[in-house]
């Protein structure tokens, strides 16, 4: 709950805020969780703590790890965790999914793309914007404060947008880039990171020994037919076909449905004649498309049959 994922690129600045909030007067101590070593506050260090902020100036791949922040007040202590991952710069232009911030949608009336995390930094204009790695040029694009405005949005404006700015710390400049996808709402189709509607994460499903049971994996991927999108089941991290238990079968083919205009896929897992050993297995509902993979885990528990006394 009080853990936050943060990421950045090597040799760029990264500033992380403690997920636990407190008054400015409260002191915040930062530690590297693996070693419980205190993070220094002296600004001469490459990695240092500055109140609620943890600063990597610049970041290195070796900085990856979990950092603990403790907000101390006269009456309580609050602990938060920052899970930091620093990636190597890609040699090609394509931005991998794990470096992408949340997708934003726009329409003809509202086409603001905010530069993610920029509020944490001491930056000065101009903010540079790139689409699919190419610098944006033309009067339709306006860099305004911390966001980009696109005039007369068209379907072809959908894409991956990167903002680039300079963070200044005590006279030293550090580069920062952040990328997010932009989709145009009124286009015929758009794609989302898969959203699993069922089962709920870590759901416990009650089954009766000796009876049949069905589990449905259902996920939505966006609007319109989705390219290379799929839902499937795994048993203990293995494909159903490779698991080798003939009683447990995945329905052939995926059923396509539409929910609130979104394209969704269902896959039913059928377990015949449920046995005790089935309760020990981990059942994973997987949904994937070109954006990435989402997984929800289900476990089975024995449903106690109601005793009927004559």
């Amino acid at each position: 709950k009080f853990s936050k994922q943060s990421w950045g690129l090597e040799n760029e600045a990264l500033i992380v805020r403690c997920p636990r909030q407190g008054k400015p007067s409260y002191t915040v101590d930062w530690y590297y969780s693996q070693t419980n070593k205190s993070i220094p506050t002296q600004e001469r260090n490459r990695v240092f703590a500055s109140g609620q902020l943890l600063k990597f100036l610049p970041a290195a791949v070796a900085d990856s790890g979990i950092y603990t922040c403790i907000v101390r007040s006269p009456t309580f202590n609050r602990t938060g965790y920052a899970n930091v991952t620093i990636y190597k710069k890609q040699s090609d232009c394509n931005v991998p999914d794990y470096l992408m911030y949340s997708t934003v949608s726009g329409s003809e009336k509202n086409s603001k793309i905010y530069c993610p995390t920029i509020d944490l930094y001491n930056w000065t204009a101009p903010l540079e914007w790139f689409k699919n790695c190419q610098a944006l040029q033309g009067s339709r694009y306006r860099a305004h404060k911390s966001f980009l405005v696109i005039d007369n949005v068209m379907t072809e404006d959908a894409g991956d947008y990167t903002c680039k700015f300079i963070h200044n710390e005590n006279g030293a400049n550090y580069s920062v880039t952040a990328t997010r996808s932009f989709t145009v709402k009124d286009e015929q189709g758009f794609s989302l990171f898969p959203v699993i509607g069922a089962p709920a994460q870590n759901e416990i499903k009650e089954v009766e020994i000796g009876k049949n049971a069905n589990l449905t994996c259902s996920a939505c991927f966006g609007k319109g037919t989705q390219f290379l999108a799929a839902v499937l089941w795994q048993l203990n991290g293995t494909k159903i076909t490779d698991f080798g238990e003939p009683r447990i079968q995945q329905e052939e083919g995926q059923n396509q449905s539409f929910s609130n205009g979104l394209a969704c896929l269902d896959m039913v897992l059928r377990i015949a004649d449920v046995k005790e050993e089935d309760l020990l297995l981990q059942y994973d509902c997987l949904a994937l498309n070109l954006h990435g993979l989402r997984r929800h885990t289900v476990r089975l528990s024995r449903k106690n049959p109601i005793d009927h006394h004559s």
Epitope: Q90, D97, G159, F227
Partner: antibody, heavy 122, light 107 residues
Framework: EVQLLESGGGLVKPGGSLRLSCAAS????????MSWVRQAPGKGLEWVSA????????YYADSVKGRFTISRDDSKNTLYLQMNSLKTEDTAVYYC???????????????WGQGTMVTVSS | DIQMTQSPSSLSASVGDRVTITCRAS??????LNWYQQKPGKAPKLLIY???SLQTGVPSRFSGSGSGTDFTLTISSLQPEDFATYYC?????????FGQGTKVEIK
């Protein structure tokens, strides 16, 4: 430099088997869906198969389903295509290609190998 | 499966000409269309993705447009190195399908 290099093509008799390999370099191989596309002599391009970045899911063209198997070894940055029960109509140059996502949900084959020739003939 | 039809199948043009190739899908495919260039004995090369986005490193004389079922690839001023075969490909649904190709030859 981003590169894909196929190998394993050759002459095989109908009903025979062949395994194609595609060595990737210059990018984070495990992050990408990969595909095989073929081109019969003097003909157009035909998509054959695709595999997700986690090797969790695979897709096949109807013409090869049940005969071809796509796989990958992310530790070796290598994509494979196992071709069994080969037919004369499988004769083609086989290309491996990287799939790049676009934000509207589609994908393009943005990096291609140089291709390897597979000839099925008695 | 979605059928992709290109026209013309071949065309003759001179250096400096403006060349237009069209691609029609058998059903609406939004903007999920890509264009490739292939020279004899070489692998295809991505030119345009998502109907109108220019792939990095591709000259700006290439442009793409269209949405739904009708798409166009335009070469504003044909250069000697542009004589090749061009393919469209839809990525709206699986399986991805290609057009039959358009060969651009020297007049």
């Amino acid at each position: 430099e981003v590169q894909l290099l196929e190998s394993g093509g050759g002459l095989v008799k109908p009903g025979g088997s062949l395994r194609l390999s595609c060595a990737a370099s210059g990018f984070t191989f495990s992050s990408y869906w990969m595909s095989w596309v073929r081109q019969a002599p003097g003909k157009g391009l035909e998509w054959v198969s695709a595999i997700s970045g986690t090797a969790i899911n695979t897709y096949y063209a109807d013409s090869v389903k049940g005969r071809f198997t796509i796989s990958r070894d992310d530790s070796k940055n290598t994509l494979y295509l196992q071709m069994n029960s080969l037919k004369t109509e499988d004769t083609a140059v086989y290309y491996c290609a990287r799939v790049r996502r676009d934000s509207s949900g589609g994908g393009a084959f943005d990096i291609w190998g140089q291709g390897t020739m597979v000839t099925v003939s008695s | 499966d979605i059928q992709m039809t290109q026209s013309p199948s071949s065309l003759s043009a001179s250096v400096g000409d403006r060349v237009t190739i069209t691609c029609r899908a058998s059903q609406g495919i939004s903007n999920n269309l890509n264009w490739y260039q292939q020279k004899p004995g070489k692998a295809p090369k991505l030119l345009i993705y998502a109907a109108s986005s220019l792939q990095t490193g591709v000259p700006s004389r290439f442009s793409g447009s269209g949405s739904g079922t009708d798409f166009t690839l335009t070469i504003s001023s044909l250069q000697p190195e542009d004589f090749a075969t061009y393919y469209c490909q839809q990525s709206y649904s699986t399986p991805p399908t290609f057009g039959q190709g358009t060969k651009v030859e020297i007049k």
